[in-house]
Each structure stands twice: as C-alpha cells, then as structure tokens.
C-alpha cells in the first residue's frame, strides 16, 4: 500500500485514513514548508489516541480547531485545509507500523515562500 497522495485547496476538507495500520495510536505531520507556519523542520505529533476515547490534540499546534476524528478511534480524520498544510501525515501504529498521506495544498509553494504572515491561517484572496 503506497499510501495516499491528496490535493486540495485552502478551505476544503480532506479525509486522512490509516490504511494498513492495525492499532493506530498517533498521527504525526512533517510539513513541506515549515517556515510558512513559523515552525522548525521535522516531524511533529498532531493527535494521539486516548483511553477516554476522545483523541488528544496538543494545544499549540497548527491544526487546532481544524482536525477532527471521524470514528471512535483515530483511524479516519477530517482536516479543514489551510495554506501551509502541505506535507506528509503519518499514522503510527502500536506495533511500529505506519501509513502515510502526502498532502499538497494548492498554491503553497508560492504562498509559503512569499514574505508576510508565517502562521498561514488565512489564505490571501
């Protein structure tokens, strides 16, 4: 399973799924343009499964208020896209297995290299 490769525009919703991972425990994001959101390079956790059944989302991350689980676990997520979200989303399993989704957000390569806001939460019209 090569994983997903999804295209979308700011303001659209995309579904991220955890294909081939038996017990998903967390999602990790490696941004293509980290500086666009004022971040450093590398992977960062964006969501964990929790025993309460409600996934844990770190408070200081770019997807707060835009990412939600579509099922009782964290196998399927819905993300409301924003400029700068381009990157690779990894679904990590309990047994070290993982799946990946490569996301390309329309205009990111241009928008994220332009001077201006680094948070990327509002897409210029």
């Amino acid at each position: 399973n090569p994983g997903a490769s999804l295209d979308g525009r700011p303001g659209d919703r995309v579904n991220l799924s955890c294909g081939g991972v038996s017990h998903p425990i967390r999602w990790v994001w490696a941004p293509s343009f980290p500086a666009c959101k004022g971040l450093s390079k590398g992977r960062r956790p964006i969501l964990w499964a929790s025993s309460s059944g409600t996934p844990t989302v770190p408070p200081l991350q770019p997807f707060v208020g835009r990412l939600r689980s579509l099922d009782s676990g964290i196998r399927r997520l819905e993300l409301l896209l924003s400029a700068g979200d381009s990157g690779t989303f990894f679904c990590k399993g309990r047994h070290e297995d993982e799946s990946r989704t490569v996301l390309h957000v329309l205009g990111d390569r241009t928008y994220c290299k332009a001077p201006g806001p680094t948070h990327g939460s509002v897409y210029p019209q």
Epitope: N1, A4, D12, N15, G19
Partner: antibody, heavy 119, light 107 residues
Framework: EVQLQQSGAELVKPGASVKLSCTAS????????IHWVKQRPEQGLEWIGR????????RYDPKFQGKATITADTSSNSAYLQVSSLTSEDTAVYYC????????????WGQGTSVTVSS | DIQMTQTTSSLSASLGDRVTISCRAS??????LNWYQQKPDGTVKLLIY???TLHSGVPSRFSGSGSGTDYSLTISNLEQEDVATYFC?????????FGGGTKLEIK
C-alpha cells in the same frame, strides 16, 4: 460559464515535439489544478499529470515522465502540454481539464485535441 | 499504481431500465472515487465525485455508492441521452488512474 478551449488538431512527424494549449474562461486557473489526460483511438483514459498553476508544481504518471511536460501561464489563464520524441504510440486525443482537488474529481474538461503522428 | 477494473466493457439495456456499472480498485481508496460520462462525440463530463456526490447539473437518476475497493454507478431510469461510455477514476493517490470504461447502449 466555465470553459476550457483547446488548440486545434495536429499532424506531426515521428521524433518531433508538439505543444498543445488550453485556455480557460469563467475561472482563474491559479485557483484550480489543471490536468492532462490522454486517450488513444478506441482506448480508455490515461492520466498524464497535473499542475498547480500558481506555483508551477507539476506531478506526472511515471510512464509520462520525460515524455510530457505540463506548464501554465497565469497571465493568459492558459495551460500547456508538450509531448516530445513523438512516436505512433502518442497518436491520441489529449484533454485538458480542471480539478479543485482529490475530493472533487475532474469537474470540467476541454473538447480535446487530436494529435496524429505520421511520416 | 492503483489498478481500476470495470469488468463489464459493454452492456445493453432498454429505455427505462435500472442500470448498474461496477468498478473495483486494487486497494482501499477511501471513497476517493469519481465517475465520468464520455459521449460518442468525445465530450467528457463529471457525473459523481467522492463516491456519491452528484456534480452540479447532473440528473438525479444518476447515483453512486460503495466503499473500500468496490464502487458502483447506477442509472435509475435509462434515457436515450445516456448512451455513452462510463469511466471510474480514483483520486486517492498519484498517479490518478481510470477504469477501462463501460460502453452503454440501448437495446
């Protein structure tokens, strides 16, 4: 009204290159992905690739890598497909089309451009 | 690459019939499945996107369903203007791929 107007039919010699154009009206290509699709005579549809016109970010089916080049000119609201080193296998109708992304399919298509490779 | 298979390459039905065209993906495509209609003159139109959402202007007699690897397009009340070839396409991963098509004719 959304329209994609493609250039006219081409008759080209083996080994040559051809550049097809697709001019959009009714929308700004910078706000969509532009795709190119190939259809050989009496065959199905083959996805060649797509471009994000705002940043010239192109992706291709590996079998068309090096054979096809997709470009865009946002000032003229147009996209282009160049096919090089033409052989009889490249004889086909080529469609340009637009998409808002993976969730939405390819929602509007051009009328197609027929390319015939013959000596 | 993900292979998309339309096992029926052609079918014939009567006006007013309910027709179902099926499509199978070589792996789970998470509902990123679209259907297109190509008329005999070559014109291509999107009918349904994301498995079951009707594109604007498409008659409600067209519907789509499915999940995982198996998907279908249904025409509930066949009309003469539905004579065409129908293609499925996955948008789950690059390269996007199409099924081989199902040619629909009127008996």
């Amino acid at each position: 009204e959304v329209q994609l107007q493609q250039s006219g039919a081409e008759l080209v010699k083996p080994g040559a290159s051809v550049k097809l154009s697709c001019t959009a009206s009714g929308f700004n290509i910078k706000e969509t992905y532009i795709h190119w699709v190939k259809q050989r005579p009496e065959q199905g549809l083959e996805w060649i690739g797509r471009i994000d016109p705002a940043d010239v970010y192109g992706r291709y089916d590996p079998k068309f890598q090096g054979k096809a080049t997709i470009t865009a000119d946002t000032s003229s609201n147009s996209a282009y497909l160049q096919v090089s080193s033409l052989t009889s296998e490249d004889t086909a109708v080529y469609y340009c089309a637009r998409s808002y992304g993976s969730s939405y399919g390819i929602d509007y298509w051009g009328q197609g451009t027929s390319v015939t490779v013959s000596s | 690459d993900i292979q998309m298979t339309q096992t029926t390459s052609s079918l014939s039905a009567s006006l007013g019939d309910r027709v179902t065209i099926s499509c199978r993906a070589s792996q789970d495509i998470s509902n990123y499945l679209n259907w297109y209609q190509q008329k005999p003159d070559g014109t291509v139109k999107l009918l349904i996107y994301y498995t079951s959402t009707l594109h604007s202007g498409v008659p409600s007699r067209f519907s789509g369903s499915g999940s995982g690897t198996d998907y279908s397009l249904t025409i509930s009340n066949l009309e003469q203007e539905d004579v065409a070839t129908y293609f499925c396409q996955q948008g789950y991963t690059l390269p996007w791929t199409f099924g081989g098509g199902t040619k629909l004719e009127i008996k």
